[in-house]
């Protein structure tokens, strides 16, 4: 099967690579404009340069292109607790990221939010923290995992899902009620 | 068994208002993030808010931020999303989800769903 092509793949394709076709005159291909720059004017004819210019502070483009516009620099989102790690440039976008110690939990694609990494008080570590992915915990006797952090088993009532790990516990405590906390 | 059980859905003109309710069971509510999924007809699934255990943390996806508001009662082990000025783009089947946190975008577990219909 054929992948269906956008109008611009199309016209595209009919040129050698590094090249477009003019948007006007499709006998005429025109040099892409590099990295860094956006397309000003096409091409005035065969061989003759495509007028592109520096994109302008505060935008950028990442790759070989004929955008009429350079894009926009991305933001790095404070109230997610990002921090940038390189600024944009000419011809790379923003780079956000997290604090050290903390991990990144994606809402969307393209938009995470940062939180920190867990301890593992009470506990040993069983996978260290990594940039997309919680510290995984082993708690130690007498203490559960909950929401990957180790909390003592005197916080565990009969009904909630901590009583198989501190079942020794729970048995011990004679003639408590059972609270029906869920 | 987690049980997540959603209400408050239906038809609202464009402006109006809704709140969603989720009633959970089965798991320690007070322990979890919780939020709410939607998935608008042929579209993929999207966060459209979250809540902390403690509810001292938010998120809002930016298309509701200021519009909408999350919020939960612990007490009552119940999630709720009050929607104002709904636009014709927030139709969907809103869900009540066990926020999974690490990686994703992910959608943790989640209820049966409720429908809100936007329309004139």
């Known amino acids: 099967l054929v992948p269906h092509l956008g109008d611009r793949e199309k016209r595209d394709s009919v040129c050698p690579q590094g090249k477009y076709i003019h948007p006007q005159n499709n006998s005429i291909c025109c040099t892409k404009c590099h990295k860094g720059t956006y397309l000003y004017n096409d091409c005035p004819g065969p061989g003759q340069d495509t007028d592109c210019r520096e994109c302008e502070s505060g935008s950028f483009t990442a790759s070989e292109n004929h955008l009429r516009h350079c894009l926009s620099c991305s933001k790095c989102r404070k109230e997610m607790g990002q921090v940038e790690i390189s600024s944009c440039t000419v011809d790379r976008d923003t780079v956000c990221g997290c604090r050290k110690n903390q991990y990144r939990h994606y809402w969307s694609e393209n938009l995470f939010q940062c939180f920190n990494c867990s301890l593992c008080l009470n506990g040993t570590v069983h996978l260290s923290c990594q940039e997309k992915q919680n510290t995984v915990c082993t708690c130690h006797a007498g203490f559960f995992l909950r929401e990957n952090e180790c909390v003592s088993c005197s916080n565990c009532k009969k009904s909630l899902e901590c009583t198989k790990l501190c079942l020794p516990q729970i048995e011990n405590v004679k003639g408590t009620e059972d609270s029906g906390t869920t | 068994e987690v049980q997540l059980l959603e209400s408050g859905g239906g038809l609202v003109q464009p402006g109006g208002s809704l709140r969603l309710s989720c009633a959970a069971s089965g798991f320690t509510f007070e322990w979890y993030w919780m939020g709410w999924v939607r998935q608008a007809p042929g579209k993929g699934l999207e966060w459209v808010s979250a809540i902390s255990g403690s509810g001292g943390s938010t998120f809002y996806a930016d298309s509701v931020k200021g519009r909408f508001t999350i919020s939960r009662d612990n007490s009552k082990n119940t999630l709720y999303l009050q929607m104002n000025s709904l636009r014709a783009e927030d139709a969907a089947v809103y869900y009540c989800?066990?926020?999974?946190?690490?990686?994703?975008?992910?959608?943790?577990?989640r209820g049966q769903g409720t429908l809100v219909t936007v329309s004139s």
């Open positions: 989800a066990k926020v999974k946190l690490g990686g994703g975008p992910n959608f943790g577990y």
